[in-house]
């Protein structure tokens, strides 16, 4: 009696169980009562990443430099190419199909987390006692200068965008 289900890594065809092709290979012909499944390795820029009965291999992903992409990991016959973004850019999606420039943190904000190839810059507002006077994708908020440690006094209060201005203590006396 012909089988209705096959074992793992097999498939049912013409009332019989044939072996699937291993990752990195495509199906050329199904098995018969007398012959094994015929498989062929994928070509140079192709891959198949599962046990399969595909008659065509998939094309490796192209990391288009015009979209800011570069190869992070070269594809093999069993794996797709992995793209990432050029320095200073990050992916717009998990699939990393295109890139955008890293966000800069405006004056008054500092970098909480530096961007990676897959995540944007995370900024945070500079709190009282700290400032950032630049637009940057790397600069954190800096503490206001401690005038006292220089035997000076605060002549002008700091803001989230400006440092304090120190001056001599005796200016008002």
């Amino acid at each position: 009696e012909p089988p209705t289900a096959c074992r793992e890594k097999q498939y049912l065809i013409n009332s019989q169980c044939c072996s699937l092709c291993q990752p990195g290979q495509k199906l050329v012909s199904d098995c018969t009562e007398f012959t094994e499944t015929e498989c062929l390795p994928c070509g140079e820029s192709e891959f198949l990443d599962t046990w399969n009965r595909e008659t065509h291999c998939h094309q490796h992903k192209y990391c288009d430099p015009n979209l800011g992409l570069r190869v992070q990991q070269k594809g093999t016959s069993e794996t797709d190419t992995i793209c990432t973004c050029e320095e200073g850019w990050h992916c717009t999606s998990e699939a990393c199909e295109s890139c955008v420039l890293h966000r800069s943190c405006s004056p008054g904000f500092g970098v909480k987390q530096i961007a990676t190839g897959v995540s944007d810059t995370i900024c945070e507002p500079c709190p009282v006692g700290f400032f950032s006077n630049v637009s940057s994708a790397f600069e954190k908020c800096h503490p206001w200068t401690s005038c006292e440690t220089k035997d000076l006094v605060v002549q002008q209060a700091g803001t989230n965008k400006t440092d304090v201005v120190c001056g001599p203590q005796d200016r008002l006396r």
């Epitope: 507002p125 009282v128 006692g129 954190k140 605060v154 002549q155 304090v164 008002l172």
Partner: antibody
């Protein structure tokens, strides 16, 4: 010990000005920011602004910029807040308080009750 | 301006009970640069000026009884009184000092049953 002394009460007429005082003792006056707060009857606290006695550098809450003027007299270790063009809305208790660094308030005055009434 | 919201506005508890007061801010008060939350708690007893209890969200001011504990991070903070005493009758305020103007919550009035 560290203290901030404020007069208990001030009665002023509408449209007039009043100068509130806050006398510091028990610490080096010029090294700590002095902050001023307002508390209307039965209400919460509002920060008016602060002043650094070492240089008279100030930071104001925009809401109070045209109402309050902060000054200090380092020779008497006293901070002042002048309130102008008073209306009944300005009737409140006004507190002075010392900042640790630029931040929280570790020492408070007892407060001055300002009553604006004709 | 950062808005501070406190809840409940008032509550009545018996002596010995545990009390939890809540304070929420409209933006995060946590700063990665010093790994601190820019939040303080004050106690104001009737007819008195406020008194500092907790700063940096969880550091107890010297002289404050250890039944007072501050916790939380980011936008959600809590002041816990582990076993209320009659002398804890007061209004409790949270305050942010992350950015100018400094702002206070509207307070929680603690009453003793």
């Amino acid at each position: 010990q560290v203290q901030l002394q404020q007069p208990g009460a001030e009665l002023v007429k509408p449209g007039a000005s009043v100068k509130l005082s806050c006398k510091a003792s028990g610490y080096t006056f010029i090294n700590y920011w002095i902050n001023w707060m307002r508390q209307r009857p039965g209400q919460g606290l509002e920060w008016i602004g602060n002043i650094y006695p070492g240089s008279s550098s100030t930071t104001y809450n925009e809401k109070f910029k045209s109402k309050a003027a902060l000054t200090v007299d380092t020779s008497s270790s006293t901070a002042y807040m002048q309130l102008s063009s008073l209306t009944s809305d300005d009737s409140a208790v006004y507190f002075c308080a010392r900042s640790v660094g630029y931040w929280y308030f570790d020492v408070w005055g007892a407060g001055t009750t300002v009553t604006v009434s004709s | 301006d950062i808005v501070m919201s406190q809840s409940p506005s008032s509550l009545a508890v018996s002596v010995g009970e545990k009390v939890t007061l809540s304070c929420k801010s409209s933006q995060s008060l946590f700063f990665s640069g010093n790994q601190k939350n820019f939040l303080a708690w004050y106690q104001q007893k009737p007819g008195q000026s406020p008194n500092l209890l907790i700063f940096w969200a969880s550091t107890r001011e010297s002289g404050v009884p250890d039944r007072f504990t501050g916790s939380g991070s980011g936008t959600d903070f809590t002041l816990t009184i582990s076993s209320v005493k009659a002398e804890d009758l007061a209004v409790y305020y949270c305050q942010q000092y992350y950015s100018y103007p400094f702002t206070f919550g509207s307070g929680t009035k603690l009453e003793i049953k």
